[in-house]
């Protein structure tokens, strides 16, 4: 606890002090006082530098004195033999004695008192910037008129901070301008404009005179401008050294004027104004700016439109332009958006065709679609070549963005049929000779594939079974072979409206309009053993003449079995209808005269006993297309006959082309799975 005075005596004083002693005293007086330490008696073994015995006086880290020997007062009126005055409130006294004393030494007696210090004069560093006032136990600082004492209670300054300027135009000057500015001051001015305007400072050379820099180039007094993370200055000297106009690129500016204790000059005066924030005219490749201007400022809006074949990468799909606004921070909105080459993407795949993987899918790239030849061809033309257009679509010169359609090639067998004559009629055939041949297992019959979704057959084949099981692609209809062939599942059976349905079909004598269509659930995949037969054209070229040859095929009755396991076929000529009428109906169930013959029927056969028979019903009577000798069309469908091995009657398909097309069109919408 600090005291105002005190006494310090060596051990055993006034008796002789003992050997080998070390003792210390920590003196502390109250804050604001110094210490006056004085010795009234001193009798300590003398040695050089007081190496043996000594009393040491320490202030902080400084040794104020080291005493030994005997002392007596020089002043008869004062008992003081040695004294110390320190301007600090703490002092340490240390007494030491060594292991032996040749004589008897009595030590020392000392006293300390707290003394006032003059902080205003006693220290090298003046504690006050202006006026220093000492009092017992302390001091205080004071300021001249118009100055105020800072919070540190030592420094005086003028009240030049706190001004905030918000007007778009204004003038600011240093205190007392053009009279000398106050020393030891820090003046802070704030300019705060509306967002989107930058502060522009104008300072003429002659309006600036601030204490010059020292020899190291450091400003003693300085003017600094701070805008966000950007700083302009510090500036000092005679005449403004900075630019005439300072464009801060910010709506907020802090002005800091710092002065020291010496060298006051007239100071400075500046003007400022708010400029709408400029945005740079950026180079955005592959685009045009609307409107085009030399300079863009805050709130300006431009439309950036991509050149043809380029699009905006982000944002709306396929956008060709975007708007950008000059923002308050001097940056354009939507600056991340760029016009890049349109990417048409991976081209869509097509059924029964392919497209080579493109090297590039960007604007201008070219791709080619091809159909799976020779079983499919491109129906809608256009050559299959598409280029990546500016709108991001793959475009064909003829079809535009519409995809090519690969449809089955009709009427072209992979292998031509060659006859190998048998006893009554027909030869073994391969399904590749008749890839359109469809097998119905109940009743045992035939049909003709006319496209991916439709099978043409005779009405009498399906009238008793509206959900027939059909197979394609197999020469043999042995159960084990059928298991490996393609089974077709019907979705719906369409019997010609002119076909008369009977309660007892066995007694039928009228086979007029013996034609039906079966719509399949799933499309048939074409190949060497499965492909459709063409339909006849409607022109007179497709009118059959007597003697015209056609091919029939099927697994019906032959000269040696009730049904064939392997496909049979025969080539037979068209005959006059009377030839069929003249043949006696085998075991007629009705009067022979009751059998109906109409122009919707074709009579064919009669040569070498070649004929269709029970089990061939619904199969095609295939005739070479008069306009394309490589193709066959279904001129007829096996319908009925008076006797197997003579003449047979076939439904004349040409008379039903309109009904076929209409039925297929009206029922063409694919099922939704």
């Amino acid at each position: 606890e600090p005291t105002m005075y005190g006494e310090i005596l060596s051990p055993n004083y006034p008796q002789a002090y003992p050997s080998e002693v070390e003792k210390s005293w920590d003196i502390e007086v109250p804050e604001g006082y110094g210490i006056h330490l004085y010795f009234t008696h001193l009798d300590i073994e003398l040695s050089e530098n007081c190496a043996y015995d000594s009393v040491q006086i320490i202030s902080g880290d400084t040794e104020e004195g080291r005493l030994c020997g005997q002392r007596s007062s020089n002043n008869p009126h004062s008992p003081i033999v040695e004294e110390f005055q320190v301007p600090y409130n703490k002092l340490q006294v240390i007494f030491k004695s060594d292991f032996s004393n040749e004589e008897r030494f009595t030590g020392f007696a000392a006293y300390y008192v707290a003394t006032d210090i003059n902080e205003c004069t006693d220290f090298v560093d003046v504690p006050c910037s202006h006026f220093c006032n000492n009092f017992i136990g302390g001091y205080f600082c004071s300021c001249p008129p118009e100055y105020f004492l800072h919070d540190d209670m030592k420094n005086c300054g003028v009240n030049c901070s706190g001004d905030v300027f918000t007007a778009l135009i204004g003038e600011i000057a240093s205190p007392n301008y053009p009279k000398p500015y106050p020393e030891n001051s820090r003046c802070e001015y704030q300019i705060r404009l509306e967002k989107g305007f930058q502060v522009v400072v104008t300072l003429r050379r002659e309006d600036f005179d601030v204490e010059a820099a020292d020899s190291a180039g450091n400003c003693l007094d300085s003017l600094v401008f701070v805008a966000g993370d950007r700083q302009f200055g510090p500036y000092c000297g005679h005449g403004f050294p900075g630019p005439l106009n300072i464009e801060t690129k910010s709506n907020a500016l802090d002005i800091i004027f710092q002065t020291d204790l010496t060298g006051q000059k007239k100071g400075w005066k500046l003007r400022y104004h708010g400029d709408p924030m400029p945005c740079p005219k950026e180079d955005t490749p592959n685009s045009v700016w609307e409107p085009a201007k030399a300079k863009y400022v805050f709130r300006d809006v431009v439309q950036i439109t991509c050149l043809d074949g380029f699009e905006v990468v982000e944002g709306r799909v396929g956008a060709t332009s975007f708007y950008s606004t000059c923002q308050s921070n001097g940056k354009w909105s939507n600056s991340k958006l760029k016009c890049q080459p349109v990417d048409c993407g991976i081209p869509e795949s097509i059924e029964n065709g392919k497209v080579e993987d493109p090297e590039s899918t960007l604007f201008g790239s070219v791709i080619r679609y091809t159909c799976e030849e020779p079983y499919y061809y491109m129906e809608n033309g256009g050559g299959g070549e598409y280029h990546c257009a500016g709108n991001g679509s793959w475009v064909n010169e003829v079809l535009g963005p519409e995809l090519p359609k690969c449809v089955p090639v009709c009427g072209v067998p992979r292998e031509p049929f060659e006859e190998k004559q048998r006893i009554i009629g027909g030869s073994d055939a391969d399904i590749k000779n008749f890839p359109w041949q469809v097998f119905f297992d109940n009743p045992w019959a035939g049909g003709a594939l006319i496209n991916e979704y439709w099978v043409l057959t005779a009405a009498h084949v399906v009238e008793g079974n509206r959900e027939p099981t059909m197979y394609v692609g197999s020469t043999s209809v042995q159960t084990s072979r059928l298991a490996k062939s393609k089974m077709l599942t019907p979705e719906h059976v369409f019997i010609h409206p002119g076909w008369k349905l009977l309660e007892v079909p066995e007694g039928r004598t009228n086979f007029d309009n013996d034609i039906a269509l079966v719509r399949l659930k799933d499309p048939v995949k074409m190949g060497p053993t499965v492909s459709p037969i063409c339909l006849p054209g409607t022109s007179s070229d497709y009118n059959l003449m007597d003697g015209d040859l056609g091919l029939i095929s099927g697994w019906g009755r032959t000269e040696k079995r009730d049904r064939a396991v392997r496909l049979k076929a025969a080539r037979l000529p068209v005959a006059p209808l009377r030839k069929c009428k003249e043949v006696k109906v085998e075991k007629p169930t009705a009067d022979a005269e009751a059998y109906v013959f109409t122009p919707n029927m074709i009579c064919a056969g009669g040569e070498k006993g070649m004929d269709s028979c029970k089990g061939d019903s619904g199969g095609a009577f295939a005739v070479q297309d008069p306009n394309d000798k490589t193709k066959f069309y279904a001129a007829g469908l096996v319908s009925w006959g008076p006797q197997c091995g003579t003449y047979g009657l076939y439904t004349r398909v040409k008379n039903y082309v309109d009904w076929i097309m209409k039925t297929m069109q009206e029922n063409s919408t694919p099922r939704e799975d």
Epitope: I423, W444, R561, D562, K584
Partner: antibody, heavy 121, light 105 residues
Framework: QVKLQQSGPELVKPGTSVRISCKTS????????MHWVKQSPEKSLEWIGE????????TYNQRFKAKATLTVDKSSSTAYMQLKSLTSEDSAVYYC??????????????WGQGTLVTVSA | DIVMTQSPAIMSASSGEKVTMTCSAS?????MHWYQQKPGTSPKRWIY???KLASGVPARFSGSGSGTSYSLTISSMEAEDTATYYC????????FGSGTKLEIK
């Protein structure tokens, strides 16, 4: 009038062969298939095979492929069947039968009178 | 091969009685054919294409059926109908039934 005349009965030893003939008349021999059928008390009627007299095309029942050989002589309108490696199981009546197509398919329209083959040691 | 099963193996009927015998095929066939054989003679074609009567066959005979099930019917039994009747299929490799022996009571 159509007639199929078969050769007479045969008594043969096991392991030997026998040749049965079937002479036809009254129709076009080469126009129709000729069949051979075996009749035994145990197995009733069994089809052995068929031959197309026009081109000699033959189809056998798999069971008789190693047993029977069918041939024709077009000049005499005669069909033949040779049976080899005979055993007691081959003892039966053997028929030739012809198909005929006139106003429809007549399977086995005409039959021979049958030839009795007895295999005995 | 398609196996033909005839039933019954032996049956007898009184004169004027209706007679039905059946033949079942092991898998579906297109037609059934029937043959009549009297002792010591060759078989005769009797009914063909399931329901058609061969020439000279009395009208009291009829045939019917489809798929795997077929039958031969005599509407009114007569003494001359005593014989063995065989069914036969030619849809696949040719096979016969084991026969139904019909006797008069």
């Amino acid at each position: 009038q159509v007639k199929l005349q078969q050769s007479g009965p045969e008594l043969v030893k096991p392991g030997t062969s026998v040749r049965i003939s079937c002479k036809t008349s009254g129709y076009s021999f080469t126009g129709y298939y000729m069949h051979w059928v075996k009749q035994s008390p145990e197995k009733s009627l069994e089809w052995i095979g068929e031959i197309n007299p026009s081109i000699g095309d033959i189809t056998y029942n798999q069971r008789f492929k190693a047993k029977a050989t069918l041939t024709v002589d077009k000049s005499s309108s005669t069909a033949y069947m040779q049976l080899k490696s005979l055993t007691s199981e081959d003892s039966a009546v053997y028929y030739c039968a012809s198909d005929y197509y006139g106003g429809g398919f007549a399977w086995f329209a005409y039959w021979g009178q049958g030839t009795l083959v007895t295999v005995s040691a | 091969d398609i196996v033909m099963t005839q039933s019954p193996a032996i049956m007898s009927a009184s004169s004027g009685e209706k007679v039905t015998m059946t033949c079942s095929a092991s898998s579906s066939i297109n037609y059934m054919h029937w043959y009549q054989q009297k002792p010591g003679t060759s078989p005769k074609r009797w009914i063909y294409d399931t329901s058609k009567l061969a020439s000279g066959v009395p009208a009291r005979f009829s045939g019917s059926g489809s798929g795997t099930s077929y039958s031969l019917t005599i509407s009114s039994m007569e003494a001359e109908d005593t014989a063995t009747y065989y069914c036969h299929q030619r849809s696949d490799s040719l096979t016969f039934g084991s026969g139904t022996k019909l006797e008069i009571k």
